[in-house]
C-alpha cells in the first residue's frame, strides 16, 4: 500500500506521459488521477514504467473500480494485464472478442498462465458457448487449448465451430475428449464427399465407433498407421482382417512394426491366425485354427 500524501506543487499530472517515469511511487499515487489513468490506459504501454510504478497504477485502477474494471479499460490494459491476478480477472465481464485478442496478444509466445486461463473461462462463460470465432482465436494463440477442456466443457462446442479446428489442435486430446468431439465433427463434415470428408475427420477418429470405421473401410481411404494407432481399442477389436486391410490400404504393411502395441496387439489376439496369414506380413498371436471363439458378451446378452 502506498501512503496517502499530498501531491507536490506543480506535479499534478495533466496527462499520462513519459514525464511520469521520473515520479516516485508516492508521487504517482498522489499526483495521477485514477479517472485520467482509466481514460488514457492505451498510453501506459508506450511508457517505460518500472514494475514498482506499475504496481501503483494498478492500485489506482483497483481503487477506482473495486467491483472490476469496465471493458473500455480492460481492452487497453496491454502489458498491465500481466500484473492482474486471477482474482482480479474473475471480477471482469469481457464480451468483446477484440478485447480478448488484445489481452492474448500480450501473453503471446508464453505458456497459458492462470490469468489467461481465467480470462478465457470468463469470456466463454459470458458467451454461453464456444462459437467458431472464439475457437478460431483461442486455437490460434494456444493450439492445445481445445484439449485443455473437460469433456463437459467440450460439450458446449457447437458443430459449426469444428471447422476452425486444425489437426495440431487435437494433438494432446485424450480419448474421452475425442469421444465428445468426434460426433460433432461427423455432423459438421457430413455434406462433404468421401476423400475430402476423410481428410477433415481424420484427426477426430480417436473418438470413432466400430460402425464408422467399418463404413470408412468401404471408401478406399488409405488410413495411415499413426491415425490407426490412435483409434479406440474397443472400436478396432471387432474389425475383421479384411476390413482392416481395406481401411489401411497400402499402409497395412505397417501393422508388422506395431504388432506389440495397442490397439494392433489386442486386435491380433482376436483374429483367426488363418485370416492374419492372408496378409502375408508374418503377424503372430492369432487364434489357432480349429479353436472355437465364444463371444461371452453376446452369451450374457442372450441369458
Amino acid at each position: 500500500e502506498v501512503e496517502k500524501t499530498a501531491c507536490p506543487s506543480g506535479k499534478k499530472a495533466r496527462e499520462i506521459d513519459e514525464s511520469l517515469i521520473f515520479y516516485k511511487k508516492w508521487e504517482l499515487e498522489a499526483c495521477v488521477d485514477a479517472a485520467l489513468l482509466a481514460t488514457q490506459m492505451d498510453r501506459v504501454n508506450a511508457i517505460p514504467f518500472t514494475y514498482e510504478q506499475l504496481d501503483v497504477l494498478k492500485h489506482k485502477l483497483d481503487e477506482l473500480y473495486p467491483q472490476g474494471y469496465p471493458e473500455s479499460v480492460i481492452q487497453h490494459l496491454g502489458y498491465l494485464f500481466l500484473k492482474m491476478s486471477p482474482e482480479d480477472i474473475r471480477k471482469w465481464n469481457v464480451t468483446s472478442l477484440e478485447t480478448l485478442k488484445a489481452l492474448l496478444e500480450v501473453n503471446k509466445g508464453h505458456e497459458m498462465s492462470p490469468q489467461v486461463a481465467t480470462l478465457i473461462d470468463r469470456f466463454v462463460k459470458g458467451r454461453g458457448q464456444l462459437d467458431k470465432d472464439t475457437l478460431d482465436t483461442l486455437t490460434a494463440f494456444y493450439p492445445g487449448y481445445l484439449c485443455s477442456l473437460s469433456p463437459e466443457e467440450l460439450s458446449s462446442v457447437p458443430p459449426s465451430s469444428i471447422w476452425a479446428v486444425r489437426p495440431q489442435d487435437l494433438d494432446t486430446c485424450d480419448p474421452r475428449q475425442l469421444d465428445v468431439l468426434y460426433p460433432k465433427a461427423r455432423l459438421a463434415f457430413q455434406n462433404m464427399n468421401g476423400s475430402e470428408y476423410f481428410v477433415k475427420i481424420q484427426s477426430f477418429l480417436g473418438g470413432a465407433p466400430t460402425e464408422d470405421l467399418k463404413a470408412l473401410s468401404q471408401q478406399n481411404v488409405s488410413m495411415d498407421l499413426a491415425t490407426f494407432m490412435k483409434l479406440r481399442t474397443d472400436a478396432v477389436l471387432p474389425l475383421t482382417v479384411a476390413e482392416v486391410q481395406k481401411l489401411l490400404g497400402p499402409h497395412v504393411e505397417g501393422l508388422k512394426a506395431e504388432e506389440r502395441h495397442r490397439p494392433v496387439r489386442d486386435w491380433i489376439l482376436r483374429q483367426r491366425q488363418d485370416d492374419l496369414d492372408t496378409l502375408g506380413l508374418g503377424l503372430q498371436g492369432g487364434i489357432p485354427n480349429g479353436y472355437l471363439v465364444l463371444d461371452l458378451s453376446m452369451q450374457e446378452a442372450l441369458s
Partner: nanobody, 128 residues
Framework: EVQLVESGGGLVQPGGSLRLSCAAS????????MGWFRQAPGKGRELVAA????????YYPDSVEGRFTISRDNAKRMVYLQMNSLRAEDTAVYYC?????????????????????WGQGTQVTVSS
C-alpha cells in the same frame, strides 16, 4: 564494449557556468534514459538531472531546478548538462549514467543503483 566518457569539468567561480558532455558508445543509445549524478566528498551519489530516451521529458531535483538543463542528441549519441548559477555546494565529481528504458524494468529512474552503465566521472569545483 560499453563506454560513457564525460568531459567539460573544471574550476569555476560561484555564479559561473559549465557545460558537461557525455559520449556514449556500445549501446543502442536511443533505448536508454540518461542521467547525470554527482558525488561530493563523504556524501552519497545523487541524481541531478535525467532525460527520457526520446529526449522529450526531463527530471531535476529541487536543488538544481532552474539552474541545470539536461539535453541529448540521439544522432550523435551525446548527452549534455548545462550548469548555470553554480554554487560552492555544487562541487563534486559528476557522472554520466545510462539506464535501459523498458516496460516493467526493475527499480526506478532516480536510484543510482538501478543504472546499468557509468562513466569514470569529471570533477567540477566551484570556488573563488
Amino acid at each position: 564494449e560499453v563506454q560513457l566518457v564525460e568531459s567539460g569539468g573544471g574550476l569555476v567561480q560561484p555564479g559561473g557556468s559549465l557545460r558537461l558532455s557525455c559520449a556514449a558508445s556500445g549501446i543502442t543509445f536511443s533505448n536508454y534514459v540518461m542521467g547525470w549524478f554527482r558525488q561530493a566528498p563523504g556524501k552519497g551519489r545523487e541524481l541531478v538531472a535525467a532525460i527520457t530516451a526520446s529526449g522529450g521529458n526531463t527530471y531535476y531535483p529541487d536543488s538544481v531546478e532552474g539552474r541545470f538543463t539536461i539535453s541529448r542528441d540521439n544522432a550523435k549519441r551525446m548527452v549534455y548538462l548545462q550548469m548555470n548559477s553554480l554554487r560552492a555546494e555544487d562541487t563534486a565529481v559528476y557522472y554520466c549514467a545510462a539506464k535501459r528504458a523498458y516496460w516493467g524494468s526493475d527499480g526506478d529512474y532516480q536510484g543510482y543503483y538501478y543504472y546499468d552503465y557509468w562513466g569514470q566521472g569529471t570533477q567540477v569545483t566551484v570556488s573563488s
